[in-house]
Structures are given as structure tokens and as C-alpha cells.
């Protein structure tokens, strides 16, 4: 049994890091493998993560840890029984993938403006809380070409757009994701999408 692709890990910069790797053949990750992780700090104890399958030869492990600070560094040991398959380290602050925003809501009752709001996925005492920017994806269920991205570079988790920028009388979906420039993070996963029927009053034509 050998590791084909070494574990790569990302942290939510809160309390969960996710590590993924590939073995050289089909593997029952949860029964055959263990990922031990330990904060490099006096008196910290090692923890065991039981991986789950992620495709035939792929494994994924969710590491639970105390709230991350930028200096944290973890040792990682991947074991198959008594055999050490791989040894490495992971600094959560250097590999951040933010949590996905939540509670995306489309408010359609503000004259002819669409107001999209969502929740910041971090509590106010987390460093990322004031450093997230967002991308909002809106697309038509009827027309795959009607697909647009709005970059929200201010801190407020909301976006206003004129309903008339979208086609009237059809259904749209929206989703949102986040990233933080300060830690050069990757993008978060997309939030669950929300659906609404777009309709607005056409302005009278002037003759």
C-alpha cells in the first residue's frame, strides 16, 4: 500500500482542516488508514482522524482543532496499521479556504431593485470576519448563456442590482462564495443556491 498523491490540506481558519490524498489503488480509507495530527506545541496531544473514501483511491479527513492562530503548525502522520506511509506538516494559516457564506436571500419587494443578502460565515472575533470579499453568481434556469458574476469587494454581505438587468418573467438562481486577500486564500465553496422569479414593470415607451 502506497500513497500516490500526498495529503494536501486546507483550513477554514477557524477549527476544521480538511486533508485529501490518493492511494495507489482502491482503498477502504476508514478501515485501513489513520491520519494522526498534533499541534507542534508543548503538552499538546496527538489526535486521530478516521478518513472517509473520496472516490475509489481517494481519501479525505476532517481534522478538528482548537481555534487557529497564525503561528500554529501541525505534524501529520499517515498510518496503515503499523506502517507509516507518509509524514508531513501543515500550517493552517498558509492554506486557507474560507467557509461558504450562508442564508442567501433574494429580496424582490424593493421597487425594481433586487437585494441579495447573505451571512458572513465567521463570528466577529475571527480575523477573517472583516476581511472577506465575495463573488455572486446569478444564472437563468432557462438560458445557460445567461450567466453572470458580480464581485462584491466591500465588506457588507449584500448586493443590489436593478431587476431590469435580468430578463423579466423567468426564473433565476443565485449563489455566493467568499475569499480573503489578506491570507491569499482559495475561494470558498459556493453557498447553496436560491431561486426567484424575476419580474419588473417595463417603463412606458416615450413617443
Amino acid at each position: 500500500m502506497k500513497v500516490l498523491q500526498e495529503p494536501t490540506c486546507v483550513s477554514d481558519y477557524m477549527s476544521i482542516s480538511t486533508c485529501e490524498w490518493k492511494m495507489n489503488g482502491p482503498t477502504n480509507c476508514s478501515t485501513e488508514l489513520r491520519l494522526l495530527y498534533q499541534l507542534v506545541f508543548l503538552l499538546s496531544e496527538a489526535h486521530t482522524c478516521i478518513p472517509e473514501n473520496n472516490g475509489g483511491a481517494g481519501c479525505v479527513c476532517h481534522l478538528l482543532m482548537d481555534d487557529v492562530v497564525s503561528a500554529d503548525n501541525y505534524t501529520l502522520d499517515l498510518w496503515a496499521g503499523q506502517q507509516l506511509l507518509w509524514k508531513g506538516s501543515f500550517k493552517p494559516s498558509e492554506h486557507v479556504k474560507p467557509r461558504a457564506p450562508g442564508n442567501l436571500t433574494v429580496h424582490t419587494n424593493v421597487s425594481d431593485t433586487l437585494l441579495l443578502t447573505w451571512s458572513n460565515p465567521y463570528p466577529p472575533d475571527n480575523y477573517l470576519y472583516n476581511h472577506l470579499t465575495y463573488a455572486v453568481n446569478i444564472w437563468s434556469e432557462n438560458d445557460p448563456a445567461d450567466f453572470r458574476i458580480y464581485n462584491v469587494t466591500y465588506l457588507e454581505p449584500s448586493l443590489r442590482i436593478a431587476a431590469s438587468t435580468l430578463k423579466s418573467g423567468i426564473s433565476y438562481r443565485a449563489r455566493v462564495r467568499a475569499w480573503a486577500q489578506c491570507y491569499n486564500t482559495t475561494w470558498s465553496e459556493w453557498s447553496p443556491s436560491t431561486k426567484w422569479h424575476n419580474s419588473y414593470r417595463e417603463p412606458f415607451e416615450q413617443h
Epitope: M14, S15, I16, R34, H47, T48, C49, I50, L64
Partner: antibody, heavy 119, light 106 residues
Framework: QVQLQESGPGLVKPSETLSLTCTIS????????WSWIRQPPGKGLEWIGY???????NYNPSLKSRVTISVDTSKNQFSLKLNSVTAADTAVYYC?????????????WGQGTTVTVSS | DIQMTQSPSSLSASLVDRVTITCRAS??????LNWYQQKPGKAPKLLIY???ILQSGVPSRFSGSGSGTDFTLTISSLQPEDHAVYFC????????FGGGTKVEIK
Amino acid sequence: QVQLQESGPGLVKPSETLSLTCTISGGSISTYYWSWIRQPPGKGLEWIGYIYYSGNTNYNPSLKSRVTISVDTSKNQFSLKLNSVTAADTAVYYCARHRGSYVYGMDVWGQGTTVTVSS
Amino acid sequence: DIQMTQSPSSLSASLVDRVTITCRASQTISSYLNWYQQKPGKAPKLLIYGASILQSGVPSRFSGSGSGTDFTLTISSLQPEDHAVYFCQQSYSSPTFGGGTKVEIK
């Protein structure tokens, strides 16, 4: 598929010792944490203690003076002893496996065994 | 000991309703929070660990969120088989459970 089975007397007299064993089938006791949990009739869940396969233990502070949990890796079993029982110890007793270290939830449970403390 | 307070203690909701149960810890527990479902006469079943990670095999209508002291279990669309008692449990220190929330179908 890992299965857990609790066994032991269903009736214990006050002031005596309650003894239960959890037998693990379909998997190994190694590399996991194992807990005992109890649930008095119509009430919530109370964690009693856990043991690592190497023998390290941690007990509920409110029960610590009366509890011993031990492990027998050769039999794939771990056991609970609770001394000086009273009627308040009447409950369904469950054994369970943590899905990794103790910081993870308990993903495999026995079906539970009812223990009544009565003279 | 860390006290876990669940609310409400019981609720009644209609099929396909969105149901939310909250759990509050008496001190910060990071994301060391697990949710269980228990049906009458059965052992508890792990739904979510690490506050938000869905246990393998659990339907995606269950989700968890929160960190620190305040946590939420959400059932996005209540199904008949969701009639049960739900418990939260912290694993930051010696494990303790919330008092449970009984979910009934209207």
C-alpha cells in the same frame, strides 16, 4: 460492519457493583476511543467515561470516584464497573465508539442494556 | 463541567417545514460539537460532528452550524422519519449532552 453488544446483569442490588462488558465484532478495538453512556428512564444522556485501546481513561467527574473502565484487547472487549450503586443508577447503559479521537462524535453504538438497581 | 443548553425542549412542525434546534455551551468549545438523533427504544445515531460535518450516510437535509458557544441543527425539509429526540454533545472536555429536543410531526 462494526457492531457493539453490551452484556451483564439486568438487576443489581443497592450498594453493590454494576458490571457490564461491551464486545466488539466486525472490527478491531485498536486505534479507537470507546465510551460508556447511560440514559435513565425518560431522561437525557449522561457520559460515564472513555478508554483508549492502550488503556488510557477519562471519567465523568461526577462519577469518577465510583467508576472503572478497562480494556481487554485479546477479547476485543471493554468493561464498566460502577461501585456502590443506588436507585439513581437505574438506566439503559450504552457502549459506543468514537470516530477517531475523543474529540469526534460517537458513530457506532450498542443497542443498550437496561440495568435496574433494586433490592 | 461544561453545561449544554438545548432549545426548544420540544417542537411540532409540518412535513417539509424547516426546523431549527439550538444548543448553547456554558463556555467556548470551538467546533467540538456533535448532534445525535434518537428514536424511541433505539440507541442514538450520530448525525453531525465537528459542528458542521455530516456523518457518512446521513441525509443532506440535516446541517449544522456554529462555533464557540452557539450552535444550530437544521432540518431543511422535515420528513416523517425525522420524528425523534435530538441531542447535542460537546467533546471539548469531558463530554456532556444537551437535554434533548423532541421533534414531532403535526
